[in-house]
Amino acid sequence: SQVSQNCHNGSYEISVLMMGNSAFAEPLKNLEDAVNEGLEIVRGRLQNAGLNVTVNATFMYSDGLIHNSGDCRSSTCEGLDLLRKISNAQRMGCVLIGPSCTYSTFQMYLDTELSYPMISAGSFGLSCDYKETLTRLMSPARKLMYFLVNFWKTNDLPFKTYSWSTSYVYKNGTETEDCFWYLNALEASVSYFSHELGFKVVLRQDKEFQDILMDHNRKSNVIIMCGGPEFLYKLKGDRAVAEDIVIILVDLFNDQYFEDNVTAPDYMKNVLVLTLSPGNSLLNSSFSRNLSPTKRDFALAYLNGILLFGHMLKIFLENGENITTPKFAHAFRNLTFEGYDGPVTLDDWGDVDSTMVLLYTSVDTKKYKVLLTYDTHVNKTYPVDMSPTFTWKNSKLPNDITGRGPQ
């Protein structure tokens, strides 16, 4: 139901949901630090623009007694309980930052009259697509799907001369929140990915995956999975792999591949890693000193949520417009704003756009090298290494179906 917003008379409040169940197991203190870093910048920008207003964040914690799984499984009710808490205390701000779990975001969006914007660091699932007042600051599953279809269809690159139409998807149910929803989108029979592929089978058991690696009767040479190299090693070990198998390892929020001293282990030679462009190094910034490389994106999304709110608040105040209106709630999309570590672009539906990077292991140097990049904003692939030193025959990616000739 409608809750009055603390969002007028020169005082603007941000409600930050600090949920026990979260897309990433990040200490809430780190998220608080990220929010406070963002607030300092927003206040400075508003002050320098001659806007004499107050901006604060209210951190809303759940009691943690009922919803204590720590992951997203019991997040649906936790999100609604927090909203009820806000409602009872009449403490809704101008904007809601969090939740990060797809279940809770979907349910909260359904069960509230959203006349305020909702900014999420997560909510990766397709069920959170096309929500008019929801902004997602970490790459959602839809963006991954569009890359995969684009890449599958590509057949005019020196290293990829076949278009693909088949795939196996490995999904065993133990995935992290981001991987769960990425794979869920690929599995869904009504998704764009499924619609565009002629053959797709989900492998749910370790043995199924292991058997496919050398199965002469396999229906596809391509296997998509999600996680880090260690996850792959636990599953694959040092097993022999047919020479025309291609494993696509989706590991978006991990910039360790770009570190100078990293050498790719031997089991990664027939793997293409899909990750996000590392952009810039955050190692020296005050909010990220305590963060592991894989957690940085999550805290950064909270920080960027604050900066996005500040960006919109400044625009509306400078134009003399009211903040507690549907216009404000619907404005957090189709724009580029000054993110903490560089410009951040949101698409027409409020979802972050990014540069995805496909890496391969060089057989010469045993280093990860960039094969191509993909701009989610324009749905376009840009080849980087025209003469990759692949493990695959003739330094070309194989056909997706063994024995099928050029197309």
Epitope: G44, N48, N284, S285, T336, E338, G339, D341
Partner: antibody, heavy 114, light 107 residues
Framework: QVQLQESGPGLVKPSETLSLTCTVS????????WSWIRQPPGKGLEWIGY???????NYNLSLKSRVTISRDTSKNQVSLKLSSVTAADTAVYYC????????WGQGTLVTVSS | DIQMTQSPSSLSASIGDRVTITCRAS??????LGWYQLKPGKAPKRLIY???SLQSGVPSRFSGSGSGTEFTLTISSLQPEDSATYYC?????????FGQGTKVEIK
């Protein structure tokens, strides 16, 4: 309102490093993106690079191998270093605040000549 | 890189005239465009941001319009102090790029 003032040597010898400082008053440098832009005599404007809130940087690819932008929050200053300069680097150099270059300094002319 | 094609490269007009400068982007940039006024020895000044929003303190005779790839800066009634070079800038895509500039002179 934020005010910017560029400073540095007006004459630099070829192959040396050009060093400029942008001193900011009326606001903290931590609250803005910072850019350097240059304008060679009789030509248009060329963006050199950004330094973001986080302190990380992004440079124009044509200059990337020679340019370094840094900041000193204690002095509220942003710096530009351009190495191995040639006569083609002779220009008026400006610093600017914000992704959309909201505020500019008045610029400083740097001549590269022996 | 996105190319910004600005026209005309120069113009001469009388005081009170309506002056229009256009900028065309090589690909769509939404409204991520600003207009800047440069005068020798002075700090450049942003006149318009987000394609059509007037910068605080800038006279209302300046206005901007357009979205996507076609943008216009209009000076509704040219004044002596408007003699300057005007540039457009896109910051939608990396790297930010400027138009070639338009030199405005008073007849």
């Amino acid at each position: 309102q934020v005010q910017l003032q560029e400073s540095g040597p007006g004459l630099v010898k070829p192959s040396e490093t050009l060093s400029l400082t942008c001193t900011v008053s009326g606001g903290s440098i931590r609250h803005y993106y910072w850019s350097w832009i240059r304008q060679p005599p009789g030509k248009g404007l060329e963006w050199i690079g950004y330094i973001y809130y986080s302190g990380s940087t992004n440079y124009n690819l044509s200059l990337k191998s020679r340019v370094t932008i840094s900041r000193d929050t204690s002095k509220n200053q942003v710096s530009l270093k351009l190495s191995s300069v040639t006569a083609a680097d002779t220009a008026v150099y400006y610093c600017a605040a914000g992704m959309g270059f909201d505020y500019w300094g008045q610029g400083t002319l740097v001549t590269v000549s022996s | 890189d996105i190319q910004m094609t600005q026209s005309p490269s120069s113009l001469s007009a009388s005081i009170g005239d309506r002056v229009t400068i256009t900028c065309r982007a090589s690909q769509a940039i939404r409204n991520d465009l600003g207009w800047y006024q440069l005068k020798p020895g002075k700090a450049p000044k942003r006149l318009i941001y987000s394609a059509s929003s007037l910068q605080s303190g800038v006279p209302s005779r300046f206005s901007g319009s357009g979205s996507g790839t076609e943008f216009t800066l209009t000076i509704s009634s040219l004044q002596p102090e408007d003699s300057a070079t005007y540039y457009c800038l896109q910051h939608n895509s990396f790297p930010p790029t400027f138009g070639q500039g338009t030199k405005v002179e008073i007849k």
